[in-house]
C-alpha cells in the first residue's frame, strides 16, 4: 500500500496472507467459513511452494493470539484466467480446515448485484505489500481509502487504453494505491467486498496508471458455484 | 495511574433498557482494544463485548450478539455499553476491561445491574 | 466453543504454603491463558499472562505454567493478602472464557 497507514489492529477481521514457503504473497480476503478469495496469478508466482492462508494476523512476524495459518486443501483459480492478461484474475482457496471465527477472524459480505459502484465513492485497500517505491515491505497490515474511478475515465488512451472490461472496476492512484504484494486483497465499499486487486505488474502511486480491482459481483455465479 | 471507571448500573425491569459507561484515564485510550466483562451472582465472569481501539470492529458472543452495543468516543475517553432485551439472567457485575497483549490487563471496579420486576 | 474447567472450587491452605490451581481446557489453547486475583469490591487484578509472563509488580511466588490442554497456577508463601478468588482466562483466538474460579482460604 503506497500512501496509506498502519490498519486499526484486527478492525478488519476478513483480511488474509497468502504465504508461499511462509512468506508473504499475495492479499486474500475470508468470504466463508472455509474460502478465501484471491488473484489468479498469485498462484503463478508460489512455483511449486507450500502454498497456506494466514488469517487473524495484523503483525506477520509478531505472536498474537488471533493468527492461524491455515494449509490449503484447494486451489480453484477461475477457468478462464490465463497468465498474459489481467481478465478474470480471481482464486478461490479452500482451507484444510474451516476457520475458527472470533474478533480477529470473520468473512465479509461480498457484492452480489452486478451494477457499479458510484465514481467518487471512498473505498478501502489494505495489505501487507510494498509500501514505497525502493520496495519496503512493512509487518503490519496497512490501508488506504480510495475513490472509486469511473470506467471511461480509467479507459482513456493516456491511462488504461480500453483495457478496463465491465468486469473490473477502477480506483485513483495518485500517490495512494494499493501495490505489489496487495494483489488477491480486498477493495471494500461501504462494509461490502466490491473488488479484488488484480496482480498486474502495474506501476503503482502513478496517477495515469489507476489501480483495477476484479468486480466481485460479475463474478457471482461462478463464486457459488465453487463454493456449493 | 490506569484508571476505568464503570457508571450507569441499577435496577431495570425485564424487557428495559439500560446504557453502561466507563471513563478511562492514565493512559491512551484511543490505543487500547477494550472489551465488557460480567460477574453472574453465581461469581462466574462472562465475557459480553469487544471494540477495536478505533471502534472498526465489534464483537459479542451468541449469549448477547444482537441484544448488546458496545461503542466508544475516543475524544472523551469513554466506553460504552447499551443493553436492551434485558431479562433476568443479565443480572451482573459489569466490568469494563483494557486489553494488552490480548489478556484484560486492567479492570474497572465494576457497576452493579439488576434485572427484576 | 471451547471450555475452561478449573478445580478446585475452594481450597484451604496455610500461611507460608504453597497451592496449585489448574485449569483444563477442552483443545489446544497454544499457551494463550491468563490468570487473575479478585477480591470483593474490586476488578480483578491480572497477575499471569501467556501461561508464565508475570505482570509488572507482581510478586515472584506467583507462578504459571503449561502447554496445549493443561494450565497450572501456583502462589508458595502464602500471605493473608493472598485470601482471593482465582481465575484462568482462555484468549486464544481472540475468545475470552474463564474457568469457574477457585476460593483461596487461610487456615
Known amino acids: 500500500i503506497l500512501g496509506g497507514r498502519e490498519a486499526e489492529a484486527h478492525a478488519r477481521p476478513y483480511m488474509a496472507s497468502v504465504q508461499v514457503n511462509g512468506e508473504h504473497l499475495c492479499g486474500g480476503v475470508l468470504v466463508a467459513e472455509q474460502w478465501v478469495l484471491s488473484a489468479a496469478h498469485c498462484l503463478e508466482d508460489a512455483a511449486d511452494g507450500k502454498v497456506q492462508v494466514l488469517l487473524g494476523a495484523h503483525s506477520l512476524s509478531q505472536p498474537e493470539p488471533s493468527k492461524r495459518l491455515y494449509d490449503v486443501l484447494r486451489a480453484v483459480p477461475h477457468p478462464d484466467s490465463r497468465p498474459d492478461t489481467i481478465d478474470h484474475d480471481l482464486l478461490l482457496l479452500q482451507l484444510s480446515e474451516k476457520a475458527t471465527l472470533g474478533p480477529a477472524v470473520r468473512p465479509l459480505p461480498w457484492q452480489r448485484v452486478d451494477r457499479d459502484v458510484e465514481p467518487g465513492t471512498l473505498c478501502d485497500v489494505a495489505g501487507w505489500g510494498i509500501v514505497s517505491h525502493a520496495g519496503r515491505r512493512p509487518d503490519r497490515l496497512q490501508h488506504v481509502l480510495l475513490p472509486v474511478l469511473d470506467r471511461a475515465t480509467c479507459n482513456r488512451r493516456t491511462h488504461h487504453d480500453g483495457a478496463i472490461t465491465q468486469r473490473m472496476m477502477c480506483a485513483e492512484s495518485n500517490r495512494r494505491d494499493s501495490c505489489k504484494g496487495d494483489s488477491g486483497g480486498p477493495l471494500v465499499c461501504g462494509g461490502v467486498l466490491e473488488g479484488v486487486v488484480t496482480s498486474g505488474s502495474r506501476v503503482c502511486g502513478n496517477r495515469k496508471k489507476p489501480g483495477i480491482y476484479t468486480r466481485v459481483a460479475s463474478y457471482a455465479a461462478w463464486i457459488d458455484s465453487v463454493l456449493a | 495511574e490506569v484508571k476505568l471507571v464503570e457508571s450507569g448500573g441499577g435496577l431495570v425491569q425485564p424487557g428495559g433498557s439500560l446504557k453502561l459507561s466507563c471513563a478511562a484515564s492514565g493512559f491512551t485510550f484511543s490505543n487500547y482494544i477494550m472489551s465488557w466483562v460480567r460477574q453472574t451472582p453465581e461469581k462466574r465472569l462472562e465475557w459480553v463485548a469487544y471494540?477495536?481501539?478505533?471502534?472498526?470492529?465489534?464483537y459479542y458472543p451468541d449469549t448477547v450478539k444482537g441484544q448488546f452495543t458496545i461503542s466508544r468516543d475516543n475524544a472523551k475517553n469513554t466506553l460504552y455499553l447499551q443493553m436492551s432485551s434485558l431479562k433476568s439472567e443479565d443480572t451482573a457485575i459489569y466490568y469494563c476491561a483494557r486489553h494488552d497483549f490480548y489478556a484484560l490487563d486492567f479492570w474497572g471496579q465494576g457497576t452493579s445491574v439488576t434485572v427484576s420486576s | 466453543d471451547i471450555q475452561m474447567t478449573q478445580s478446585p472450587s475452594s481450597l484451604s491452605a496455610s500461611l507460608g504454603g504453597k497451592v496449585t490451581i489448574t485449569c483444563k481446557a477442552s483443545?489446544?489453547?497454544?499457551?494463550?491463558i491468563a490468570w487473575y486475583q479478585h477480591k470483593p469490591g474490586k476488578g480483578p487484578r491480572l497477575l499471569i499472562h501467556?501461561?508464565?509472563t508475570l505482570q509488572p509488580g507482581i510478586p515472584s511466588r506467583f507462578s504459571g505454567s503449561g502447554s496445549g490442554r493443561d494450565y497450572s497456577f501456583s502462589i508458595s508463601n502464602l500471605e493473608p493478602e493472598d485470601i482471593a478468588t482465582y481465575y484462568c482466562l482462555k484468549y486464544d483466538n481472540l475468545l475470552y472464557t474463564f474457568g469457574g474460579g477457585t476460593k483461596l482460604e487461610i487456615k
Open positions: 471494540i477495536t481501539n478505533g471502534g472498526g470492529a465489534t
Open positions: 483443545q489446544d489453547i497454544n499457551k494463550y
Open positions: 501467556y501461561t508464565s
